[in-house]
């Protein structure tokens, strides 16, 4: 129950041993009590004891004092438990009875007789203090006291507030007299179920499951979770925010694993060679004459420098070398010729010019060939033109440098910032922070590299028509429809077919005239360009060694808008007609000028959705036909092409889908 009405019987006096009817008890009044507790009544009436009733065993004969007894029969005070909110008022009827029968259960005996009764009506507040009273009539006197207390775990003025002290997963508290919770030390909250963390524990980065604890969230460490943890791959770096890798002094690279002072720390170069802190391993050895090898550890043969000219063969001798000259040549290095132009000495289409009144000659070699007789194929890579560990490649009449990650430029001489590697997915903005890239993610994405999508799927509603494939965009409500052949529009809702009343003849004539005009302009421009072009190597290499195929496949820079000067894309599909597929999903942070490429490869035929023009969105390029070749060349210093990737297609029927 929620509370207990307690009645303590103290003394009963019936000196003459009389019953209520005036008769006397023989041999004396063996007295027990019946107690009835009910709701307040102005006039006490018979009827059920609504708040409870209780009987005692025989407590004495005639007059007696009632002792307190806590257990068993004859318990005193008497307990009347109730299971409701105590109303504050009551009616109490106490009756004294005489029984001739059993002492322990007298209320069941026949022949019981009433000795006296008292009725108490009034108000009584819950409390521990006993209210004492005494009732007299002509024959008897009863002394007693009573009170109402709350049962265990019940509190408040009416015992209506339940509170059970606990110290477990659901709470850590004791109960105050009014029933409110009093948290145990180290706990807080409405139900005292929240631990008070270690003093100073960082509010966002730390938490606790028990008092005076400070457990760090991922990316944080230390007693108060106020120190970040560097990136997993970081080697010689620290952080100011989690997963960063800001290099210690003397270290570089994305994971601070490149020793910027390798030469000083390790002295790797042998035999008096010069060490420089560059190259793929963090150092490069420049050997003295007569030595070779990565660390200049190998001695060269005297013939290693190829001293014999005109096809002469070299033989090593103890301290020098000897050239065996082919027919028609003589001299220490076979440098003198006995031939003339009449002997047709120039190979590979070289033209012969007579010198010294016909006693000697000189060969003028076509591109790609060299040597006094044009007998050697040009290797433009012999001079090691590629810096920073770039790989030199002979490509027809020119050479190109294939740069290591982190470098660019004609000779790989330019260092790209870490952000140029585009570490941020989904259009995240990259910031270079002390050698470590940090991504600021757009709405709807999170994670160190913005790789985690945290919003609902904009494609879930199926916004694309005509069997188009839907891709979610950058912001939560963005989506992109990739239309099947024959449909266009931001939702692929428009078929490509033209209206029936289309004036075909007029349009055909108009288009024909426009095409003729364009061809005429192109011829004029081509002729002018040919006149302006210098034939020497320098001008040929000025465009970052573009192959002819690549030069033919450039979109004028005016049609592209560069919004991120750091971003570069290198796509090399090779010179064969291979299927480039999705171009490795390289994402450019550029805005595509409206109408650059509609579907079907016709610039500006169908306008893009207005929504896509004003905001940064990823542009993914992929060939939809295996015959298509997409070339893309970037040069950050090439002002002619405005530091953007110029992309084009080989054939008109090839389609480059632009998902914007």
């Amino acid at each position: 129950g929620s509370g207990i009405f307690q009645l303590r019987l103290q003394e009963f006096v019936n000196q003459r041993g009389m019953l209520a009817n005036g008769q006397s008890c023989e041999p004396g009044c063996r007295t027990f009590f019946r107690i009835c507790l009910k709701h307040f009544q102005a006039t006490f009436s018979e009827g059920p004891c609504t708040f409870g009733n209780v009987s005692t065993p025989v407590l004495g004969t005639n007059s007696f004092v009632v002792r307190d007894k806590n257990s068993g029969s004859g318990r005193n005070p008497l307990q009347l438990p109730f299971n409701f909110t105590w109303p504050g008022t009551f009616s109490l009827n106490i009756q004294a009875w005489h029984t001739p029968g059993d002492d322990l259960r007298p209320e069941t005996s026949p022949g019981n007789s009433l000795i006296s009764q008292i009725i108490i009506q009034g108000s009584l507040a819950v409390g521990k203090i006993w209210r004492t009273d005494e009732q007299n009539d002509t024959l008897t006197r009863l002394s007693y006291s009573y009170r109402v207390i709350c049962s265990d775990n019940y509190y408040g003025e009416s015992c209506s507030r339940l509170c059970k002290k606990r110290d477990d997963h659901f709470g850590h508290y004791e109960c105050q007299p009014d029933g409110s919770l009093s948290c145990l030390p180290g706990w807080t909250g409405k139900y005292c179920d929240q631990p008070i963390c270690l003093s100073g524990c960082h509010e966002q980065n730390g938490y606790c499951s028990k008092p005076d604890e400070c457990i760090c969230r991922p990316g944080w460490q230390g007693r108060l979770c106020n120190e970040c943890i560097p990136h997993n791959g970081c080697r010689h770096g620290t952080c100011s925010i989690p997963w960063q890798c800001a290099c210690d002094e003397g270290w570089g690279g994305l994971f601070c694993d490149q020793d910027l002072n390798y030469c000083t720390h390790h002295s790797p170069c042998k035999n008096g060679s010069t060490c420089s802190n560059s190259g793929p391993k963090g150092y490069t050895c420049t050997c003295l004459p007569g030595y070779t090898g990565e660390h200049c550890e190998l001695g060269l043969s005297k013939c290693a420098s190829n001293p014999c000219r005109n096809g002469g063969s070299c033989k090593d001798q103890e301290n020098s070398y000897h050239c065996l000259c082919p027919p028609g040549y003589y001299g220490q290095h076979c440098e003198h010729s006995t031939l003339t132009c009449a002997d047709s000495p120039c190979f590979n289409g070289g033209s012969c010019r007579e010198r010294n009144q016909g006693s000697s000659y000189a060969c003028e070699c076509p591109p790609n060939f060299t040597g006094s007789n044009c007998e050697k194929k040009v290797d433009r890579c012999t001079s090691n033109p590629c810096a920073n560990g770039g790989q030199c490649q002979n490509r027809g009449p020119s050479r190109t440098c294939r740069c290591r990650p982190g470098f660019t430029g004609t000779h790989c001489e330019l260092h790209i910032s870490d952000c140029a590697r585009s570490p941020c997915a989904h259009g995240g903005t990259c910031h270079d922070l002390e050698n470590g890239p940090v991504c600021t993610c757009p709405a709807g994405f999170s994670g160190r590299r913005c790789e985690v999508r945290i919003t609902h799927d904009a494609c879930a509603s199926g916004p694309c028509f005509n069997g188009a494939t839907c891709y979610t965009g950058l912001s939560p409500n963005n989506f992109v429809c990739n239309c099947p052949y024959g449909f266009v529009g931001s939702r692929c809702e428009f078929p490509v077919g033209l209206p029936p009343s289309f004036p075909w003849v007029a349009v055909s004539l108009g288009v024909g005239l426009v095409v003729l005009l364009v061809l005429l302009v192109m011829v004029v421009v081509a002729v002018r360009q040919l006149r302006l072009r210098r034939p020497d190597d320098e001008s040929r290499e000025a465009m970052n060694n573009l192959s002819d195929f690549q030069k033919d496949n450039l979109i004028p820079a005016a049609q592209l808008k560069n919004t991120n000067q750091k971003k570069e894309l290198e796509v090399d599909c090779g010179l064969d007609k291979s299927n480039c597929g999705k171009l490795q999903n390289h994402t450019l942070d550029y805005n595509l000028a409206p109408g650059l490429l509609g579907r079907g490869g016709m610039p500006g035929k169908y306008p893009h959705s207005d929504k896509s023009l004003g905001e940064k969105v990823p542009l993914r390029l992929h060939s939809e036909k295996p015959e298509c070749r997409i070339s893309a060349i970037c040069s950050p210093r090439d002002s002619m092409y405005q530091s953007v990737c110029l992309i084009s297609e080989e054939r008109n029927e090839c389609v480059i889908a632009t998902e914007v």
């Epitope: 991922p218 460490q221 943890i229 997993n232 791959g233 970081c234 770096g237 620290t238 210690d248 985690v452």
Partner: antibody, heavy 118, light 107 residues
Framework: EVQLVESGGGLVQPGGSLRLSCAAS????????MAWVRQAPGKGLEWVAT????????YYRDSVKGRFTISRDNAKNSLYLQMNSLRAEDTAVYYC???????????WGQGTLVTVSS | DIQMTQSPSSLSASVGDRVTITCRAS??????LAWYQQKPGKAPKLLIF???ILADGVPSRFSGSGSGTDFTLTISSLQPEDFATYFC?????????FGQGTKLEIK
């Protein structure tokens, strides 16, 4: 190249003590939190203890609390695990690893075997 | 403690096969999950962290996905050197806990 080399393992009687060491190289040791992870023979992996990089805050799994102590000496690029009151269930290969209790373990040593048996 | 349950416990496959291993957490661990590869007598090697980020030097045939309680490790085309035991690990709650492992064997 990151290298973590454990030592100090061996056979010990129940109730005995052992001190494991881990020598680190190839990275700036003082910048990174470190941990011990163990693997009972033929069983899975179990995190044992962690120590932060700068203030040396330590955390332990409940079953080793009060018996094991993790510590570090940044000047010596070394991590330690003092194991007291050893029990048979502590028998395992003990790995030194770079990481915290709330991060992946990026680099691991080759491990050292601790056998607790009478 | 968070329980990590891997399935299957063992798996036979051939070179070139596509293989998927799953890992289930007893509570939501957000994206704080890593995958390790362990060869007999060797230390584990970190493959993937934060559910889907490849660790330095790990081949791109390995990929991870999932969030919350269900995660997968996929090897797109098995190579001979990929036969090993794979473990998942959560680091969202203390203590960090590992899966029991999936042994990948040659068929």
């Amino acid at each position: 190249e990151v290298q973590l080399v454990e030592s100090g393992g061996g056979l010990v009687q129940p109730g005995g003590s052992l001190r494991l060491s881990c020598a680190a190289s190839g990275f700036t040791f003082s910048n990174f939190p470190m941990a011990w992870v163990r693997q009972a023979p033929g069983k899975g992996l179990e995190w044992v203890a962690t120590i932060s990089s700068s203030d040396g805050t330590t955390y332990y799994r409940d079953s080793v609390k009060g018996r094991f102590t993790i510590s570090r000496d940044n000047a010596k690029n070394s991590l330690y695990l003092q194991m007291n009151s050893l029990r048979a269930e502590d028998t395992a290969v003990y790995y030194c690893a770079r990481g915290y209790y709330n991060s992946p373990f990026a680099y691991w040593g080759q491990g050292t075997l601790v056998t607790v048996s009478s | 403690d968070i329980q990590m349950t891997q399935s299957p416990s063992s798996l036979s496959a051939s070179v070139g096969d596509r293989v998927t291993i799953t890992c289930r957490a007893s509570q939501d661990i957000y994206y704080n999950l890593a995958w390790y590869q362990q060869k007999p007598g060797k230390a584990p090697k970190l493959l993937i962290f934060d559910t889907n980020i490849l660790a330095d030097g790990v081949p791109s045939r390995f990929s991870g996905s999932g969030s919350g309680t269900d995660f997968t490790l996929t090897i797109s085309s098995l190579q001979p050197e990929d036969f090993a035991t794979y473990f998942c690990q959560q680091y969202d709650y203390v203590p960090p806990t590992f899966g029991q492992g999936t042994k990948l064997e040659i068929k």
